[in-house]
Amino acid sequence: MSGLGRSRRGGRSRVDQEERSPQGLWTGVAMRSCPEEQYWDPLLGTCMSCKAICNHQSQRTCATFCRSLNCRKEQGRFYDHLLRDCISCASICGQHPKQCAYFCENKLRSPVNLPPELRRQRSGEVENNSDNSGRYQGSEHRGSEASPALPGLKLSADQLALVYS
């Protein structure tokens, strides 16, 4: 048993301490609070990456991460961590956060593809909504594009795709 779980008597043998933990860390603490984008699996007695369970109807606690992950898979949408909602970039182009830059800039270059409300907005027919623009200020700093946390590992998007494909 690795140090991430609790042994029956609370102490750990030399073997316990030397066993490699499931996260690839060597640790001697009973860890019940996990890094972001991981959850504590009480049966496994360790932190687990949420990414592996997003396809499950799990009772465990990865709902927010999985919503975010699924949202990022949809083109033209991004996950707003403050609102805890999947936002359509088309609805906020013109006052959009960094996550929508690619979508909105491409759409604005090609007005034929824009929905009517955005064509009007581009022509100045719709005035800015300060609530919206305020809401998204600084949202690019929320790390909604971060990779799933694997403690002790820094993986690129390509590497993560390999790990979880």
Partner: antibody, heavy 118, light 107 residues
Framework: QVQLVQSGAEVKKPGASVKVSCKAS????????MHWVKQKPGQGLEWMGY????????KYAQKFQGKVTMTSDKSTSTVYMELSSLTSEDTAVYYC???????????WGQGTLVTVSS | DIQMTQSPSSLSASVGDRVTITCRAS??????LNWYQQKPGKAPKLLMC???RLHSGVPSRFSGSGSGTDFTLTISSLEQEDFATYYC?????????FGGGTKVEIK
């Protein structure tokens, strides 16, 4: 469909080692934790430990520390469970079982009988 | 470790009977209680997870109930293929632990 196919029965001498394999198919191998469960003849089920194939992290039941080693081979989607210093107490059927992330084991291998006899 | 106690250890019943097996945990396991069916010479099969959620392909005559420490598996009308040994398992706390099993035999 999900399938876990284990290696065949083994007969070993006391003091020897044995390595049992469990080949997974029908799902993404690295996304699931694999557990091993022991069942002595005519007895109940006993959890031994698990391995996370994506990084070969392991966790073993206290009773099996020093007795069992679990490894995996991502290229063949196979997990292995090795028992060392065999005694008659190790005579049992060993099962691999996939963890479903909700506290249960949703698919099981067919079992491998290991007999330790002089 | 959490101890799981099943009762009875064996029972005799006839086809068509209603059968109830109980499982008690030594401490609260919420609803993380699973049931498995095992036939002689075969691997266990998951019947039910999270107390009452049937695994795919499991007939609706099987049902589960309980919460905390006391749980029940019920077979509403026993069929020939249901004669087997049933195990409960807690999935709430490391390490996972199994009950001792209940053998359902033909009367």
């Amino acid at each position: 469909q999900v399938q876990l196919v284990q290696s065949g029965a083994e007969v070993k001498k006391p003091g020897a080692s044995v390595k049992v394999s469990c080949k997974a198919s029908g799902y993404t191998f690295t996304n699931y934790v694999m557990h091993w469960v022991k069942q002595k003849p005519g007895q109940g089920l006993e959890w031994m430990g698990y391995i996370l194939p994506y990084n070969d992290g392991t966790k073993y039941a206290q009773k099996f520390q020093g007795k069992v080693t679990m490894t995996s081979d991502k290229s063949t989607s196979t997990v292995y469970m090795e028992l060392s210093s065999l005694t008659s107490e190790d005579t049992a059927v060993y099962y691999c079982a996939r963890y479903d992330y909700e506290g249960s084991f949703d698919y099981w291998g067919q079992g491998t009988l290991v007999t330790v006899s002089s | 470790d959490i101890q799981m106690t099943q009762s009875p250890s064996s029972l005799s019943a006839s086809v068509g009977d209603r059968v109830t097996i109980t499982c008690r945990a030594s401490q609260d396991i919420s609803n993380y209680l699973n049931w498995y069916q095992q036939k002689p010479g075969k691997a266990p099969k998951l019947l039910m997870c999270y107390t009452s959620r049937l695994h795919s392909g499991v007939p609706s005559r099987f049902s589960g109930s309980g919460s905390g420490t006391d749980f029940t598996l019920t077979i509403s009308s026993l069929e020939q293929e249901d004669f087997a040994t049933y195990y409960c398992q807690q999935g709430n706390t490391f390490p996972p632990t199994f009950g001792g099993g209940t053998k359902v035999e033909i009367k």
